[in-house]
């Protein structure tokens, strides 16, 4: 995949950022040991990776969270990798679910998502979770990225 | 990524090896259905994958472990993917954490880590865990690898 | 990996399909937001991805399942990524294991497998689980794919 100017490498890896926003969409930052290969992929509004070129991409996310069965809802913790293409509704690409731990005060668990998807120019991918307050933001625990095949 | 001599494929996949060494760094071997594309990536001292060429790499590790909450420390089992570049301290690229199981004698869990990172010539990546004695070395359970984009 | 006609992109991502078959091999379909780059990779009999070209492939699978410790066997839930090459016995490439949850009626957990492997022309990869009836088939929960380096 070492490519010429006509076909440059496109890759990104961004790092989780704690947020006070009351939204299920996780926030990310270009900080620490991040990757942003060039302007053909961008992090927009700290929440979505947007690509300029059509093609096949391997997209991945890792989410570490700490939760307790008694303090959480009955529903499991779910992380979703979602796609928003121009002129289309958003859709779920991948999901993972983990039942809350019985450990006190909370039990840590990590989820990894990854798959190959066709993206259109201007398409954005983002990560949703059921409870962002449970997400762990320590070094390396929660990250999000992609690479163009 | 099918490439010419100027730009060969670089990829590795190595298999976990039980070790009596008293270190948190996991040991690996070129055994079973392993991959070592060429000498542009090498397994050094059974513990680190070292690359000769600068570039973007997708690096991954999978660790399966068996632990019990009562027999383990309060802290969760943590697997860390770490980077050591020449002339730099080692640094954490990715981490995953799983709280110990209440199952007896121990409960198995699997962790997967993966992300895209820029590596310098001579850079090494390795995997650290909180308790190597809990790692499962049965066929396919614990492995480590990379591919150059 | 943007390639010419001589060296086209090869990638697939298929979606889990509930099955009444009494087999441990998971079933997949080209439905939803699936990927099938061209006829150099095919989904055969709804259960295996078969490649026509030799080379290095990153192969991955994600399995979400819901199980309960009391209602399940003592053994953990295991997902295996397996290889069948022409004229060879099948072999395990990767495995992950998760102990059943104590949550009622069942606790959801997600497993992710991925690694780089050399495949021969005509080689097939497939996914085995200990109990297919426990697998979750909701949108995005369980998928399987590969990409040629």
């Amino acid at each position: 995949m070492q490519k010429g100017d006509q076909n440059p490498q496109i890759a990104a890896h961004v790092i989780s950022e704690a947020s006070s926003k009351t939204t299920s969409v996780l926030q990310w930052a270009e900080k620490g040991y991040y990757t942003m290969s060039n302007n053909l992929v961008t992090l927009e509004n700290g929440k979505q990776l947007t690509v300029k070129r059509q093609g096949l991409y391997y997209i991945y996310a890792q989410v570490t969270f700490c939760s307790n069965r008694e303090a959480s809802s009955q529903a499991p913790f779910i992380a979703s990798l979602c796609l928003k293409s121009p002129g289309r509704f958003e859709r779920i690409l991948l999901r993972a679910a983990n039942t809350h731990s019985s450990a006190k005060p909370c039990g840590q668990q990590s989820i990894h998502l990854g798959g190959v998807f066709e993206l259109q120019p201007g398409a954005s991918v983002f990560v949703n979770v059921t409870d962002p307050s449970q997400v762990s933001h320590g070094t390396g625990f929660t990250s999000f990225g992609l690479l163009k095949l | 990524m099918q490439k010419g001599d100027q730009n060969p494929q670089i990829a590795a996949h190595v298999i976990s090896e039980a070790s009596s060494k008293t270190t948190s760094v996991l040991q690996w071997a070129e055994k079973g259905y392993y991959t070592m594309s060429n000498n542009l990536v090498t397994l050094e001292n059974g513990k680190q994958l070292t690359v000769k060429r600068q570039g973007l790499y997708y690096i991954y590790a999978q660790v399966t472990f068996c632990s019990n909450r009562e027999a383990s420390s309060q802290a969760p089992f943590i697997a860390s993917l770490c980077l050591k570049s020449p002339g730099r301290f080692e640094r954490i690229l990715l981490r995953a954490a799983n709280t110990h199981s209440s199952a007896k004698p121990c409960g198995q869990q699997s962790i997967h880590l993966g992300g895209v990172f820029e590596l310098q010539p001579g850079a090494s990546v390795f995997v650290n865990v909180t308790d190597p004695s809990q790692v499962s070395h049965g066929t396919g359970f614990t492995s480590f690898g990379l591919l150059k984009l | 990996m943007q390639k010419g006609d001589q060296n086209p992109q090869i990638a697939a991502h298929v979606i889990s399909e509930a099955s009444s078959k009494t087999t441990s091999v998971l079933q997949w379909a080209e439905k939803g937001y699936y990927t099938m780059s061209n006829n150099l990779v095919t989904l055969e009999n709804g259960k295996q991805l078969t490649v026509k070209r030799q080379g290095l492939y990153y192969i991955y699978a994600q399995v979400t399942f819901c199980s309960n410790r009391e209602a399940s066997s003592q053994a953990p839930f295991i997902a295996s990524l397996c290889l069948k090459s022409p004229g060879r016995f099948e072999r395990i490439l990767l495995r992950a294991a998760n102990t059943h949850s104590s949550a009622k009626p069942c606790g959801q957990q997600s497993i992710h497998l991925g690694g780089v492997f050399e495949l021969q022309p005509g080689a097939s990869v497939f996914v085995n689980v200990t109990d297919p009836s426990q697998v979750s088939h909701g949108t995005g929960f369980t998928s399987f794919g590969l990409l040629k380096l």
């Epitope: - | 008293t22 948190s24 760094v25 050094e44 390795f126 | -």
Partner: nanobody
Framework: EVQLLESGGDLVQPGGSLRLSCAAS????????MMWVRQAPGKGLEWVSE????????YYADSVKGRFTISRDNSKNTLYLQMNSLRAEDTAVYYC?????????WGQGTLVTVSS
């Protein structure tokens, strides 16, 4: 049991020299890249120098380049740091460590004080 025992630290005048040693035991020394790190009073850890397993590749922090020389004797399981043209800012506790898994094992360190 893994042990790293640093020695050779002393009080020395600016411009002077010292040779630090690190005796390793409990692991296969020749399998490990090794390094020297230091901690000045009230400061964080600073990477100083490192050497590969065979001793064929060495690296130095800019602040010590041309003044310090790292070496090893695998037959004696010992790491060395030859320190020349010492300056006041080299005052620190010096530790040796493995380059991979550096936080697994630490010795007591050896104190180098550069003062007139």
């Amino acid at each position: 049991e893994v042990q790293l025992l640093e020695s050779g630290g002393d009080l020395v005048q600016p411009g002077g020299s010292l040779r630090l040693s690190c005796a390793a035991s409990g692991f296969t020394f020749s399998d490990e890249g090794m390094m020297w790190v230091r901690q000045a009073p009230g400061k964080g850890l600073e990477w100083v120098s490192e050497i590969n397993q065979q001793g064929s590749a060495t690296y130095y922090a800019d602040s010590v380049k041309g003044r310090f020389t790292i070496s090893r004797d695998n037959s004696k399981n010992t790491l060395y740091l030859q320190m020349n043209s010492l300056r006041a800012e080299d005052t620190a506790v010096y530790y040796c460590a493995k380059t991979i898994g550096m936080f697994d094992y630490w010795g007591q360190g050896t104190l180098v004080t550069v003062s007139s």
